[in-house]
């Protein structure tokens, strides 16, 4: 369960892959598509609002026997839309939803040497947001400290402007 209904902090950032490709969001046919692509130099990176929550995470749910307070995150690239895990389809989708957000919108945040982060599904421990065929997908990872596969590693670049500009 999420400890508090409000996040402990929020930040505005651009999201890129380990190989410095940008994560972009495009409105197509009244729904959002998520792309992983090389950005032209002059093109502005898409912004994502990251909201950080503290959560209790029982050991029975975790791939490595970890319990205790976890740091979780939701990702919102545009107002009222959040990244969500679709575990049945092994896909990552953008859905419009109201608060309280569903569990599928929460991801356990993992740091790898602080240069990169990875996002583990709250609803499916051991499954991470990753890159597959220039799209985001859910990828099962054999749990180890490395979480080493580059396709589940992402970089966050802070955008220093007031959060409200995002919406």
């Amino acid at each position: 369960s999420i400890t508090g209904i409000s996040p402990i902090t929020e930040s505005l950032a651009s999201l890129s892959t380990y190989n410095d490709q940008s994560i972009t969001f495009a409105l197509e046919d009244e729904s959002y598509e998520i792309y992983v692509e090389d950005l032209k130099k002059d093109k502005k990176k898409d912004k994502v609002l990251l909201s950080y929550y503290e959560s209790q995470h029982p050991s029975s749910e975790s791939g490595d026997g970890v319990d205790g307070k976890m740091l979780m995150v939701t990702l919102s690239p545009t107002k009222d839309f959040w990244l969500q895990a679709n575990n049945k389809e092994h896909s990552v989708e953008l859905h419009k939803c109201e608060k309280p957000l569903p569990d599928q919108a929460f991801f356990v945040l993992h740091n790898r040497s602080f240069n990169c982060v990875s996002f583990e599904c709250k609803t499916d421990p051991g499954v991470f947001i990753g890159v597959k065929d220039n799209h985001l997908a859910l990828i099962k990872v054999d749990y180890s400290e490395n979480l080493g596969s580059e396709n589940i590693l992402f970089k966050l670049s802070e955008i220093l402007e007031h959060h409200h500009h995002h919406h």
């Epitope: 902090t9 930040s11 995470h57 050991s59 975790s62 945040l109 966050l156």
Partner: antibody
């Protein structure tokens, strides 16, 4: 309640090694990482490195790489920090500190040990 | 390494005063900043984490604000037990680094 209890003060000669212990209680030891932070007399705080209690994975500050070893003993819920080739600049109080969040290192601490004074003198 | 610059290095104040301490990071650290209070011979005690979150059990006269590179710790009404040294710490990138400290002394 969560407690981190450290070993007693040590006096060492230059070139020697010291091993400081930090015994944890009041929580599931393997769920949280432990960092070590030192403070020279009258000086500020300096992060030395981190160990994940669950599997012994470590991340050391470059300054201490090759001279420090952090370990854990999950049977006794104890973390250890060994510093080798001591010199007078290593005279400091050494603290252990518990990660605020389990599962991954985020650099946030909530509980600290009481500190262990290590004096290096010939 | 990210440099954390705290100011002032010391401040003289009286009980009841409002005290403000600032911390500047050499590069953006999102909101990953903590504030600690340390008294002589004691371990640091967490006051604020993630820039603005009050640690459980810490009096509400302590507050934190800021994001990116500039952060502030405010003590709204200084109490006798608040005379101590205060440190900021960034938790955004390795190695973790601390500010040089601000000593709050009795005027």
């Amino acid at each position: 309640q969560v407690q981190l209890v450290q070993s007693g003060a040590e006096v060492k000669k230059p070139g020697a090694s010291v091993k400081v212990s930090c015994k944890a209680s009041g929580y599931t030891f393997t769920s949280y990482g432990i960092s070590w932070v030192r403070q020279a007399p009258g000086q500020g705080l300096e992060w030395m490195g981190w160990i994940r209690a669950y599997n012994g994975y470590t991340n050391y500050a470059q300054k201490f790489q090759g001279r420090v070893t952090m370990t854990t003993d999950t049977s006794t819920n104890t973390a250890y920090m060994e510093l080798r080739t001591l010199n007078s600049d290593d005279t400091a109080v050494y603290y252990c500190a518990r990660d605020r969040y389990s599962g991954s290192f985020h650099g946030n601490f909530d509980y600290w040990g009481q500190g262990t004074l290590v004096t290096v003198s010939s | 390494d990210i440099q954390m610059t705290q100011s002032p290095s010391s401040v003289s104040a009286s009980v009841g005063d409002r005290v403000t301490i600032t911390c500047r990071a050499s590069q953006g650290i999102f909101s990953w900043l903590a504030w600690y209070q340390q008294k002589p011979g004691k371990a640091p005690k967490v006051l604020i984490y993630a820039a603005s979150n009050l640690e459980s059990g810490v009096p509400s006269r302590f507050s934190g604000s800021g994001s990116g590179t500039d952060f502030t710790l405010t003590i709204s009404s200084l109490q006798p037990e608040d005379f101590a040294t205060y440190y900021c710490q960034q938790a955004n990138s390795l190695p973790l680094t601390f500010g040089g400290g601000t000593k709050v002394e009795i005027k």
